[in-house]
C-alpha cells in the first residue's frame, strides 16, 4: 500500500507528510490506524494534523504506530499510510543505523550534504552541523541554506553528519536532529 516510513527522537519535533499527495485545495483527514481515532487539528494538542502534515510537537515513544491519511477531492478519496517510529535518544555518540537517512556521496567538485526532511519544518538559518558528534568548525565547512558544503573534500571527511535546527510553531521552539552518512568518491 501507499506507505512511508518516518522516524524521530523523543522530545524532538517530528513532522510527517502524507505519502498520498493531493492538490493544495484538497482536505486531508488523519487517523491513528490502531484505534481508528481521528487526529485533532487544533494546534493546542501535542500531536495534531495540519493539512498534508502530521505534527508531533514534541514526539513521544508512545506515538509510534501507523497513521492513516485520507486525501479528499470533490470526487475521489485516496489513502496513504505513515509508519511512524519514535526512539529514545541513544546514550552514546554513535547514531544507530535505524536513525540514519540515506547515504550521500561527494567528491572534490561536489560536496553538498542536504539536511534530511528539513523542508517540512519552519526553521531559520543557520543550521548547526556535527560530524561524529563534534561541532564542525573551520573555514572548510559552510552551512548554506539546508546544505553543508565542504571545501577541498578529503577521504577523511567521510563519516556520519548530523544537522540540528529549531522548528518554530506558534512561538514555541522545538529541536530537530537528522543524521546521514557521507562517503567520498574519487573523481
Amino acid at each position: 500500500k501507499f506507505s512511508k516510513q518516518s522516524w524521530g527522537l523523543e522530545n524532538e519535533a517530528l513532522i510527517v507528510r502524507c505519502p498520498r499527495q493531493g492538490k493544495p485545495s484538497y482536505t486531508v483527514d488523519w487517523y491513528y490506524s490502531q484505534t481508528n481515532k481521528s487526529i485533532p487539528t487544533q494546534e493546542r494538542n501535542r500531536v495534531f494534523a495540519s493539512g498534508q502534515l502530521l505534527k508531533f510537537l514534541p514526539a513521544a515513544v508512545a506515538d509510534s504506530g501507523i497513521y492513516t491519511c485520507i486525501v479528499r477531492s470533490p470526487t475521489f478519496n485516496r489513502t496513504g499510510y505513515a509508519n511512524v517510529t519514535i526512539y529514545k535518544k541513544p546514550p552514546s555518540c554513535n547514531v544507530p543505523d535505524y536513525l540514519m537517512y540515506s547515504t550521500v556521496s561527494g567528491s572534490e567538485k561536489n560536496s553538498k550534504i542536504y539536511c534530511p526532511t528539513i523542508d517540512l519544518y519552519n526553521w531559520t538559518a543557520p543550521l548547526e552541523w556535527f560530524k561524529n558528534c563534534q561541532a564542525l568548525q573551520g573555514s572548510r565547512y559552510r552551512a548554506h541554506k539546508s546544505f553543508l558544503v565542504i571545501d577541498n573534500v578529503m577521504t577523511e571527511d567521510a563519516g556520519d553528519y548530523t544537522c540540528k535546527f529549531i522548528h518554530n510553531e506558534n512561538g514555541a521552539n522545538y529541536s530537530v536532529t537528522a543524521t546521514r552518512s557521507f562517503t567520498v568518491k574519487d573523481e
Partner: antibody
C-alpha cells in the same frame, strides 16, 4: 457538467499532418492534467501523451515521440495534439481525457473522456 | 514499461452470474491501478481507482481487490448492461499502460 469534445480527425496520407483539438467545459481546465489516448480499430487502449496543468510539463509514448506534440491553451480551455509524419499504424480513434488528481511527478486515473475523433492514415 | 496482462481474453456468462476478471502487472504498481468499462462505440468509463475504490456513481456490484502485481475486478451479479470490454490501467509511472482487455459476453 464536465464535457470534452474532440475535433480535427479525418483522412490523411502517410507522412502527412493533422491537428486535433479538445474543447473542455464544466471545470477549471487550467489546474488539471490532460491526456490523449488512442484506440486502433478493434484493438485496446494506448496512452499517447500527457500534459501537466499550469506547469505544462509534457510526456509522450515512445511510439509517437518526436512526431506528436501536445499543447494547451488555458485561456481557451482547449487541448491540442499536433501529429506530424503520420503512419498507417497511427490510425485510431483519439480520445482526450482528464486526470482529476495528479500532482507533479505523479499520475492518476482518467475520470472524464471525450467521444473520440477518428484519424485514418491511408494512401 | 509496465506490462499489464488481463485474463481471460473472453468471459462468457449469463445475467445474474458472478464475473471475475484478472489483471497481472509485470512489476509492482502498489495500488495504483484502475478498471474501466467500454461499450461498443463509446468512450471508456472509470469503474475502480486505487485498486479497490469505486468511482462516483458506480454500482456496488463492482468491486476491485489486489495490490502489487495481482488484481481482480469482480462483478457480483451481472446485469444486462454489464456486458462490455473491461480494461485495467496502471498509473504508478509513465508510460501509463493498459491491459489488452477482457470481453464479458452473454453466454
Amino acid at each position: 457538467e464536465v464535457q470534452l469534445l474532440e475535433s480535427g480527425g479525418g483522412l490523411v496520407q502517410p507522412g502527412g499532418s493533422l491537428r486535433l483539438s479538445c474543447a473542455a467545459s464544466g471545470f477549471t481546465f487550467s489546474i488539471y492534467d490532460m491526456i490523449w489516448v488512442r484506440q486502433a480499430p478493434g484493438k485496446g487502449l494506448e496512452w499517447v501523451s500527457s500534459i501537466r496543468g499550469e506547469g505544462g510539463g509534457t510526456y509522450y509514448a515512445d511510439s509517437v515521440k518526436g512526431r506528436f506534440t501536445i499543447s494547451r491553451d488555458n485561456s481557451k480551455n482547449t487541448l491540442y495534439l499536433q501529429m506530424n509524419s503520420l503512419r498507417a499504424e497511427d490510425t485510431a480513434v483519439y480520445y482526450c481525457a482528464r486526470d482529476p488528481w495528479s500532482t507533479e511527478g505523479s499520475f492518476f486515473v482518467l475520470d472524464y473522456w471525450g467521444q473520440g475523433t477518428l484519424v485514418t492514415v491511408s494512401s | 514499461e509496465i506490462v499489464l496482462t488481463q485474463s481471460p481474453a473472453t468471459l462468457s456468462l449469463s445475467p445474474g452470474e458472478r464475473a471475475t476478471l484478472s489483471c497481472r502487472a509485470s512489476q509492482s504498481v502498489d495500488d495504483d491501478l484502475a478498471w474501466y468499462q467500454q461499450k461498443p462505440g463509446q468512450a471508456p468509463r472509470l469503474l475502480i481507482y486505487d485498486a479497490s475504490n469505486r468511482a462516483t456513481g458506480i454500482p456496488a456490484r463492482f468491486s476491485g481487490s489486489g495490490s502489487g502485481t495481482d488484481f481482480t475486478l469482480t462483478i457480483s451479479s451481472l446485469e444486462p448492461e454489464d456486458f462490455a470490454v473491461y480494461y485495467c490501467q496502471q498509473y504508478i509511472t509513465a508510460p501509463l499502460t493498459f491491459g489488452q482487455g477482457t470481453k464479458v459476453e452473454i453466454k
